[in-house]
């Protein structure tokens, strides 16, 4: 297992209406086919999965039918969008890339994107 | 067990206020959002609103907006439900429902509802 | 508001008919939509989570499909138990909204 570093940003701010999105970008030391794509979530010590998608390189991120993750990809970047966030999904949101064929097998883990997530105050409730 | 226990029966007259009771036991209690969710006799399930027992903020359903109020006792995993102003098309079953943030491992929305309340309004 | 329309309102089955019940959205929604079962006189059971997601201790006659505006909650094969009103529900943002329920009756 090889090393290869990830960069995400910092922090963002999901929408109002509960979507975040934010850009996975890795190293790659040679020429992948596929790659592995997974997001993790930090809060209060646990570490938990919350989306994983393997793709080929030039086609969609394919991730299951209930993921509440899409994606996208354009060379060593991956563009993510997670949906359904509320306050309680605030947390670190770690991008974790694997460089599965052809050998050798690349990891590569993100520092974590902050999300933060804010519930609508009351008021006359459009759609938030 | 998940258990989301419910104050019992209300009969009151119109313009009287009531407040509906939902403790938690058997979880995470500030871990989950609660819902209040209502059915009038014979009819469909209507939202009126969502508090986070973590913040005690909530929002409610627009046709609410006003009349009703959620609030969250920690010490009790107890959320309450007030609704003022109330008028004969209030009749109905009360219920509460938790509900887990999307990115809780194999949490499913609304997966437990309190035994329901019947609050009856008549003069 | 958003709105929910379910169809058909209502309906009448065989025991061991396939049936289908859909569910409209008036906006996208992605696949953050529930189903449930409520039988007469109880409280509502929740079937299906995120459009797909059968909800643990389910059977497996019931199955979820459909994203954006456009939903259906199928039966494989009809049992007596069934009889009952079924509604979907957007979730994970409000308005937290049912649709108007469909009543299912066994022939």
């Known amino acids: 297992c090889k090393a290869m570093h990830v960069a995400q940003p910092a922090v963002v701010l999901a929408s109002s209406r509960g979507i975040a999105s934010f850009v996975c970008e890795y190293a790659s030391p040679g020429k992948a086919t596929e790659v592995r794509v997974t997001v993790l979530r930090q809060a209060d010590s646990q570490v938990t999965e919350v989306c994983a998608a393997t793709y080929m390189m030039g086609n969609e991120l394919t991730f299951l039918d209930d993921s509440i993750c899409t994606g996208t990809s354009s060379g060593n970047q991956v563009n993510l969008t997670i949906q359904g966030l509320r306050a309680m999904d605030t947390g670190l949101y770690i991008c974790k890339v694997e460089l599965m064929y052809p050998p050798p097998y690349y990891l590569g883990i993100g520092n974590g994107t902050q999300i933060y997530v804010i519930d609508p105050e009351p008021c006359p409730d459009s759609d938030f | 067990q998940v258990q989301l226990v419910q104050s019992g029966a209300e009969v009151k007259k119109p313009g009287a206020s009531v407040k509906v009771s939902c403790k938690s036991s058997g979880y995470t209690f500030t871990s989950y959002y609660m819902h209040w969710v209502r059915q009038a006799p014979g009819q469909g399930l209507e939202w009126m609103g969502i508090i986070n027992p973590s913040s005690g903020g909530s929002t409610y359903a627009q046709k609410f907006q006003g009349r009703v109020t959620m609030t969250r006792d920690t010490s009790t995993s107890t959320v309450y439900m007030e609704l003022s102003v109330l008028r004969s098309e209030d009749t109905a079953v009360y219920y509460c429902a938790r509900d887990p943030p999307i990115t809780m491992v194999r949490g499913a929305p609304f997966d437990y509802w309190g035994q329901g309340t019947l609050v009856t309004v008549s003069s | 508001d958003i709105q929910l329309t379910q169809s058909p309102s209502s309906l009448s089955a065989s025991v061991g008919d396939r049936v289908t019940i859909t569910c409209r959205v008036s906006?996208?929604?992605?696949?953050?939509l529930n189903w449930y079962r409520q039988k007469p006189g109880e409280i509502p059971k929740l079937l299906i989570y995120?459009?797909?997601s059968l909800q643990s201790g389910v059977p497996s006659r019931f199955s979820g499909s459909g994203s954006g505006t456009d939903f259906t909650l199928t039966i494989t094969s009809l049992q007596p138990e069934d009889l009952a009103t079924y509604y979907c529900?957007?979730?994970?943002?409000?308005?937290?909204?049912f649709g108007q329920g469909t009543k299912l009756e066994i022939k």
């Open positions: 906006q996208d929604i992605s696949r953050l």
């Open positions: 995120r459009a797909s």
């Open positions: 529900q957007r979730t994970y943002s409000a308005p937290y909204t």
